[in-house]
């Protein structure tokens, strides 16, 4: 069964800066990755970045840099000020569309009482099947 993992980290140098890393643990071919915050995309969440393995990367504020780390994992750096700033309890979600498995999504947030610059190791988050 495919799994999606999500890791959220607050940067020690900039407290309004977050790094989100997501990965897909499956044998299928990834066709699209969507990163959202505030909940799953299409369920109250807002898209921050879209990453297509062949068509490139699109991102919107407060996303600063989205990138493919490997063929099955991505990272996104967020920074903001004022209304668009992420906060410590913000939920971030990554949705991987793959063939033939379909769409798999997982969400994560900053570990409770974590020190800036530290984060929990990337572990598979609760998996939501997107029909």
């Amino acid at each position: 069964t495919p799994e999606v993992w999500v890791q959220v980290r607050m940067e020690a140098t900039e407290l309004s800066s977050f790094t989100i890393r997501c990965g897909f643990l499956g044998s299928g071919s990834i066709s699209l990755v969507t990163v959202s915050w505030g909940g799953p995309n299409g369920a109250g969440g807002t898209t921050l970045a879209v990453l297509h393995p062949e068509r490139g990367i699109r991102q919107w504020a407060p996303a600063r840099q989205a990138r493919w780390e490997t063929q099955s994992s991505i990272s996104l750096i967020l920074e903001g000020s004022g209304a668009s700033s992420p906060c410590a309890n913000t939920t971030f979600c990554c949705k991987f569309a793959s063939f033939p498995e379909g769409s798999w999504e997982a969400c994560g947030s900053l570990p409770p009482s974590s020190d800036p610059g530290l984060s929990a190791p990337p572990t598979p988050a609760p998996i939501l099947r997107a029909d």
């Epitope: 297509h52 393995p53 490139g56 504020a61 990138r67 493919w68 991505i74």
Partner: antibody, heavy 114, light 113 residues
């Protein structure tokens, strides 16, 4: 069928503004970002910017930043581009294009003339 | 900004002939994570909006005839039409899909003799 229907041709005076619309149909409007592209007569294509329909967050080509404003109306599945302080150099066909430039609008001809 | 340079600016061929056109970028369009080249090709027929032909430098968009082939990597790319048809009369544009702002080449105008 996915379609992007744009507003009709515009004849505007130098210094004025123009607002072009792009109505999407055949898909969920908030699922795909929207691009705007300029094509001067007989010339190449210039990307103006894109907008995330989820929250109305835009990206702009630095060349158009400050003069172009991209907005969306989710209730009508319509994207808008406003261009201000027009000069003759802005006379062109303007296209909306959804997603990764997968589907293009019909185009809107803007003529700037006194 | 990444500058896209296409050549030739125009060419005239007879139906059935093979044609190749070039696109060069000022920076590499290869993504290190996916090992894919973020380059797209578009066809614009007279009086129509552009139409996506090829993305990822070599992947044909659904419905595009297999006589259209994209190739290349890094900064040098080629679009080949193996046997030109009358309906291929158009301007062909390449586009940087690698980094903002998305930029297009000046186009290659294909005329049929």
């Amino acid at each position: 069928e996915v379609q992007l229907q744009q507003s009709g041709p515009e004849l505007v005076k130098p210094g004025a503004s123009v607002k072009i619309s792009c109505k999407a149909s055949g898909y969920t409007f908030t699922d795909y970002f929207m691009n705007w592209v300029k094509q001067s007569h007989g010339k190449s294509l210039e990307w103006i910017g894109d907008i995330n329909p989820n929250n109305g967050s835009p990206n702009y080509n630095q060349k158009f930043k400050g003069r172009a404003t991209l907005t969306v109306d989710k209730s009508s599945s319509t994207a808008y581009m406003e261009l201000r302080s027009l000069t003759s150099e802005d006379s062109a066909v303007y296209y909306c294009a959804s997603g990764y430039f997968d589907v293009w609008g019909t185009g809107t001809t803007v003529t700037v003339s006194s | 900004d990444i500058v896209m340079t296409q050549s030739p600016s125009s060419l005239s061929v007879s139906a059935g002939e093979k044609v190749t056109m070039s696109c060069k970028s000022s920076q590499s369009l290869l993504n290190s994570g996916t090992q894919k080249n973020y380059l797209a090709w578009y066809q614009q027929k007279p009086g129509q909006p552009p139409k996506l032909l090829i993305y990822g430098a070599s992947t044909r968009e659904s419905g595009v005839p297999d006589r259209f082939t994209g190739s290349g990597s890094g900064t040098d790319f080629t679009l080949t039409i193996s046997s030109v048809q009358a309906e291929d009369l158009a301007v062909y544009y390449c586009q940087n899909d690698h980094s903002y702002p998305w930029t297009f080449g000046g186009g290659t105008k294909l005329e049929i003799k």
